[in-house]
């Protein structure tokens, strides 16, 4: 066989040419080479570096009858949808053997309209509370320079005179919209119109104006609210669960908040059917024509404590001789409170009342004066808290004690000589 | 299976001549880069050079180039070392390698069991 | 000519352990995004067997328990756990340029 020339020269007879052209181009990028016998695989560089996952495709044509003699092999790379990442050098590589052979370079070059990288968003912010829009767009080609707009209004002179990639707002009073022009030496790309809604400010200063052990009136400042007045706030109220999982500004309640609303002005309400003796959270928000405005931070209140709603249950009073006992039971009714014990008064018919403080207990033996002799006497209960008093029972007549029913040892109270205090007979 | 089997390998005397031979099978010759490498006894390995598919382009290693041709015959499926002016230093086990494209580029990833050329007066 | 040199030239390596052989280009055999580095295993009278290529590729049929690293200049092939039958001759091999060059060999042996 005859002696093979040294893989010196390159194959490659069609080298890959220029692309420039604007984002979202598509263009193919061609090479070609001729070599003798088994085609080898043509890869693509850019910058030197392999292209894995090249959109390649490779004809190869043989220019004689045999397979060992000349092919031409076509690599061509299509470039879909370009973006500043595909441009660069580009060239065509193979290895035949160990040796390496690349094209000669071709150059893929973006230039066109800019391009937005960040443009304004949407958003809500409170009536004259400052804020920032960001807008940010590259070439090719550079500069670009940046035109701010509110309500389709320049707010610069020129492009690239006023604030660049982001535009301080102080304040606004009513619901405006923004937008940012780019500019470069091929024209000019306009920015979406972000929309920024004025809502109004958070309610300050949310206390109590009173209390009621199952009310609370409360009043607040309101904020401002730009040009929309206020059509009403809303306030909502949460068990404080003694305090457990509400923090200041933590965002949810634990469980369900009842909800009021309050027409404003003025800017107070009453929320009413709330239990005594209570800890409660409340906040307040207040809604324009725009939206609602973000909620205050929950606020601790406590609901005071009322007096029982109803007397002891089941009052008995037995009487045997000079001792009369007397026994009854908790009310039903709330005790809109701390049950901090009873009061128990009894009469007779021709004598004065006698009041007593039982405390907790809810039995008593009454030491009676004289000989017993007094007639048609009658017992009175009453639950207390520390708001006061709850209702007294109706008057219970005192039954004379037959044998045979069951009377337990109690501690004796003697009968004071005069009333401890006086009390308004029913 | 692939298998590549060196022969002509034997005695041959300082400045003489000796054709060394490689036939391959269990795969399609004509589509392969195949390379010669040499191990001098008890050192490590040399490559001596490689030919294309078509036998039209030949790599060498600078030095041997003057020395040893590298040839094929695709329709016997035989791979070709003719050398020649061979000195002591020449004295080595050779092998016959095929070559594939293992990362892009190509590896020897099939080797014969070589044959023994001695060297010596 | 790129020169490849190999370190150590021999070494000893108890069952289960870990064999690491280390490889020198003097100079860089990356190109193109590739490491163009090879490992070659060779048995006493056989002729070598590809282990590695692209500095960390595992040839067809070879064990998990061998792994290549690196890039530029500086490659290791590391052998983990060393069985019996990996006790042989190691060789790096570059690929970058022609002539493709070898490291003169690593004897790995059981301790």
């Known amino acids: 066989a005859p002696r093979g020339t040294q893989a010196e020269e390159s194959p490659f007879v069609g080298n890959p040419g220029n692309i420039t052209g604007a984002r979202g181009l598509t263009g193919t990028l061609r090479c070609q080479l001729q070599v003798q016998g088994e085609p080898p695989e043509v890869h693509w560089l850019r910058d030197g570096q392999i292209l894995e996952l090249a959109d390649s495709t490779q004809t190869q044509v043989p220019l004689g009858e045999d397979e060992q003699d000349d092919w031409i092999v076509v690599s061509q790379l299509r470039i879909t949808s370009l973006q500043l990442s595909d441009t660069g050098q580009y060239q065509c590589l193979v290895f035949l053997g160990h040796q390496t052979f690349v094209s000669q370079p071709g150059y893929v070059g973006l230039e066109g309209l800019p391009y937005f990288l960040e443009e304004p968003e949407d958003r809500t912010v409170a009536a004259n509370t400052p804020f920032n829009l960001s807008c940010q767009a590259q070439g090719p080609p550079e500069p670009v320079d940046l035109l701010w707009l509110q309500d389709a209004v320049p707010l610069a002179t020129a492009p690239g005179h006023g604030p660049q990639r982001s535009l301080h707002v102080p304040g606004l009073n009513k619901t405006s919209s923004f937008s940012c022009e780019a500019h470069n030496a091929k024209g000019v790309t306009t920015s979406r119109t972000a929309t920024i809604t004025v809502l109004p400010q958070q309610p300050r200063n949310l206390h109590l104006v009173s209390r009621q052990p199952t009310e609370l009136e409360v009043a607040w400042t309101p904020g401002l609210s730009g040009i929309y007045p206020l059509t009403h706030c809303t306030l909502q109220a949460v068990l404080s669960d003694d305090g457990m999982g509400i923090q200041a500004g933590e965002p949810d309640p634990p469980e369900e908040p009842l909800t009021s609303q309050a027409s404003v002005p003025p800017h107070q309400l009453r929320l009413g059917s709330l239990h005594p003796h209570t800890p409660y959270h409340i906040r307040v928000a207040c809604t324009s024509s725009q939206g609602p405005s973000s909620w205050t931070h929950w606020l601790p209140v406590e609901t005071p404590e009322g007096v029982p709603l109803g007397p002891p249950e089941n009052i008995s009073a037995t009487r045997n001789g000079s001792q009369a006992f007397v026994h009854w039971q908790e009310p039903r009714a709330p005790l809109q409170g701390t049950l901090l014990g009873y009061r128990l008064a009894y009469q007779g018919q021709d004598t004065p009342e006698v009041l007593m403080d039982i405390g907790l207990r809810q039995e008593v033996t009454l030491e009676l004066q004289g000989d017993g002799s007094v007639s048609n006497l009658t017992v009175c209960v009453a639950a207390y808290t520390a708001a006061g008093d709850g209702p007294w029972s109706l008057p219970v007549p005192l039954e004379a004690w037959r044998p045979g029913q069951a009377q337990p040892v109690h501690q004796l109270v003697k009968e004071p000589s005069t009333p401890a205090f006086s009390w308004p007979w029913w | 299976e692939v298998k590549l089997l060196e022969s002509g390998g034997g005695l041959v005397q300082p400045e003489g001549s000796l054709k060394l031979s490689c036939v391959a099978s269990?795969?399609?010759?004509?589509?392969?880069?195949m390379s010669w490498v040499r191990q001098a006894p008890g050192k490590g390995l040399e490559w001596i050079g490689e030919?294309?598919?078509?036998?039209?382009?030949?790599n060498q290693t600078p030095s041997l180039k003057d020395k040893f041709i590298i040839s094929r015959d695709n329709a016997k499926n035989t791979l070709y070392l003719q050398m020649s002016k061979v000195r002591s230093e020449d004295t080595a086990l050779y092998y016959c390698?095929?070559?594939?494209?293992?990362?892009?580029?190509?590896?020897?990833?099939?080797w014969g069991q070589g044959t023994s050329v001695t060297v010596s007066s | 000519e790129l020169q490849m040199t190999q370190s150590p030239a021999s070494l000893a390596v108890s069952l289960g352990q870990r064999a690491t052989i280390s490889c020198r280009a003097s100079?860089?055999?990356?190109?193109?995004?590739?490491?163009?580095m090879n490992w070659f295993q060779q048995k006493p009278g056989q002729p070598p067997k590809l282990l590695i290529y692209?500095?960390?590729n595992q040839g067809s049929g070879v064990p998990a328990r061998f792994s290549g690293s690196g890039s530029g200049t500086d490659f290791s092939l590391n052998i983990h756990p060393m069985e019996e039958d990996d006790a042989a001759m190691y060789f790096c091999?570059?690929?970058?340029?022609?002539?493709?060059?070898f490291g003169g060999g690593t004897k790995l042996e059981i301790k």
């Open positions: 390698v095929r070559l594939s494209v293992v990362f892009y580029y190509y590896g020897m990833d099939y």
């Open positions: 269990g795969f399609d010759f004509r589509r392969y880069w």
């Open positions: 030919i294309n598919p078509a036998g039209s382009t030949i």
């Open positions: 100079e860089s055999v990356d190109n193109y995004g590739i490491s163009f």
């Open positions: 692209a500095a960390s």
């Open positions: 091999q570059q690929s970058k340029e022609v002539p493709p060059t």
